[in-house]
């Protein structure tokens, strides 16, 4: 019952798909599938995604588009890049706050909130490694600040304060006993 | 034993609404696509709705496109095409056929037909 | 739409000889060596019934003397020898690309 020839397009392609009757094209990256097509190997009517969504693949057979994510507000977020037909959103931390995840596994796609940076300067500390992705890694002391307890404490400015030998080594007094 | 029994049609107004439908027995229903082909009066053919085997897609020509819905009930083996805003010029016998796939993906035959219904559109 | 002809109309032919009916399409309805091209009887009160496909495959079933052939735009249908029982209508029908459209038709006679 079934003919010997067997025409070329046989699904197995990376760009066709058996969708209804025929192997058809895939769609381009920010369109979705409105009908298939309507002979073998050709092209599936593909429309651009509607406002607020997208498709991010080539040569998909999607007959919908993905909603647009919308960065949560409450953990701080804002949006990097807008979404578009061909990408999503990019939501991160806005310019001074870092991403903390909220899992222990944490990949691109894990949820997050942002945290403000920790400023160095405020702690009358160097700079380390700046925030971005981590928090900021504060270093020694400022010049005219010595470490005491875990903090940075003002070199004394005259001779009647006391100077603790770290203070000494660091302010240049010397012990005044 | 392949057989398709169409029922459903009969006389209706201009504007008037009709539904068809077509009892499959002696094969597996649901692995193949279906159609509905209608003969006019003066014996032209005419291919009005075509339906895939998983009921996902449905294709129709131009002259019926908004007008005719083909759908299937996978379950009770039947096949419809309910039609509205019928015309004059849809007066015709009405076929379902079962469509073969001769090569894969490729190549449809309709290779078992009902004995039709008949529809007569008239005021 | 692909347009389908056939010719002629309808022709009468004595028993036992031969006889081609023609069906020619508006457009190519060949893809990658094989003819989507199927021709169909039918007799007075009852469906179409499938004789041949891919222009040229016989279906299960039918008498050997039907025969196809054919390739891109022009195709026929060859019965040899007509006998009495083949008297009927002959349509072609394409499945390249939808719509699926249809030759308007062969009325054969037998004398």
């Known amino acids: 019952q079934g003919g010997t020839r067997s025409p070329r397009c046989d699904c197995a392609g990376d760009f066709h798909k058996k969708i209804g009757l025929f192997c058809c094209r895939g769609c381009p990256a920010g369109h979705y599938l409105k009908a298939p097509c309507t002979e073998p190997c050709g092209n599936s009517t593909c429309l651009v995604c509607p406002q607020d969504t997208f498709l991010a693949w080539e040569n998909h057979h999607n007959s919908e588009c993905a909603r647009c994510q919308a960065c949560d507000e409450q953990a701080s977020q804002v949006a990097l890049e807008n979404c578009s037909a061909v990408a999503d959103t990019r939501c991160g931390c806005k310019p001074g706050w870092f991403v903390e995840c909220q899992v222990s596994q944490c990949v691109s796609s894990s949820p997050f909130y942002c945290q403000p940076c920790l400023d160095c300067g405020a702690l009358h500390r160097h700079t380390r490694l700046l925030c971005s992705r981590r928090d900021t890694d504060c270093g020694t002391c400022l010049p005219g600040f010595y470490e005491h307890g875990d903090g940075c404490v003002s070199c004394p400015t005259s001779t009647l304060g006391s100077c603790p030998e770290r203070c000494a080594a660091v302010c240049g007094w010397r012990q005044m006993f | 034993e392949v057989q398709l029994v169409e029922s459903g049609g009969g006389l209706v107004k201009p504007g008037g609404s009709l539904k068809l439908s077509c009892a499959a027995s002696?094969?597996?229903?649901?692995?193949?696509?279906m159609s509905w082909v209608r003969q006019s009066p003066d014996k032209r053919l005419e291919w009005v709705a075509e339906?895939?085997?998983?009921?996902?897609?449905?294709y129709y020509p131009d002259t019926v496109t908004g007008r005719f819905t083909i759908s299937r009930d996978n379950a009770k083996k039947t096949l419809y095409l309910e039609m509205s805003g019928l015309r004059s010029e849809d007066t015709a016998m009405y076929y379902c056929?079962?469509?073969?796939?001769?090569?894969?993906?490729?190549?449809?035959?309709?290779?078992?037909w009902g004995q039709g219904t008949s529809v007569t559109v008239s005021s | 739409d692909i347009v389908l002809t056939q010719s002629p109309a309808s022709l009468a032919v004595s028993l036992g000889l031969s006889v081609t009916i023609s069906c020619r399409a508006s457009?190519?309805?060949?893809?990658?060596?094989?003819?989507?091209l199927q021709w169909y009887q039918q007799k007075p009160g009852q469906p179409p019934r499938l004789l041949i496909y891919?222009?040229?495959t016989v279906e299960s079933g039918v008498p050997a003397r039907f025969s196809g052939s054919g390739s891109g735009t022009d195709f026929s249908l060859n019965i040899h020898p007509v006998e009495e029982d083949d008297s009927a209508m002959y349509f072609c029908?394409?499945?390249?690309?939808?719509?699926?459209?249809f030759g308007g038709g062969t009325k054969l006679e037998i004398k």
């Open positions: 891919g222009s040229s």
């Open positions: 339906i895939s085997s998983g009921d996902t897609y449905t």
């Open positions: 002696g094969f597996t229903f649901s692995s193949y696509a």
């Open positions: 056929a079962r469509d073969r796939e001769a090569y894969y993906g490729q190549q449809y035959v309709m290779d078992y």
């Open positions: 029908q394409q499945s390249r690309r939808l719509p699926w459209t």
């Open positions: 457009e190519s309805i060949e893809y990658s060596g094989t003819s989507f």
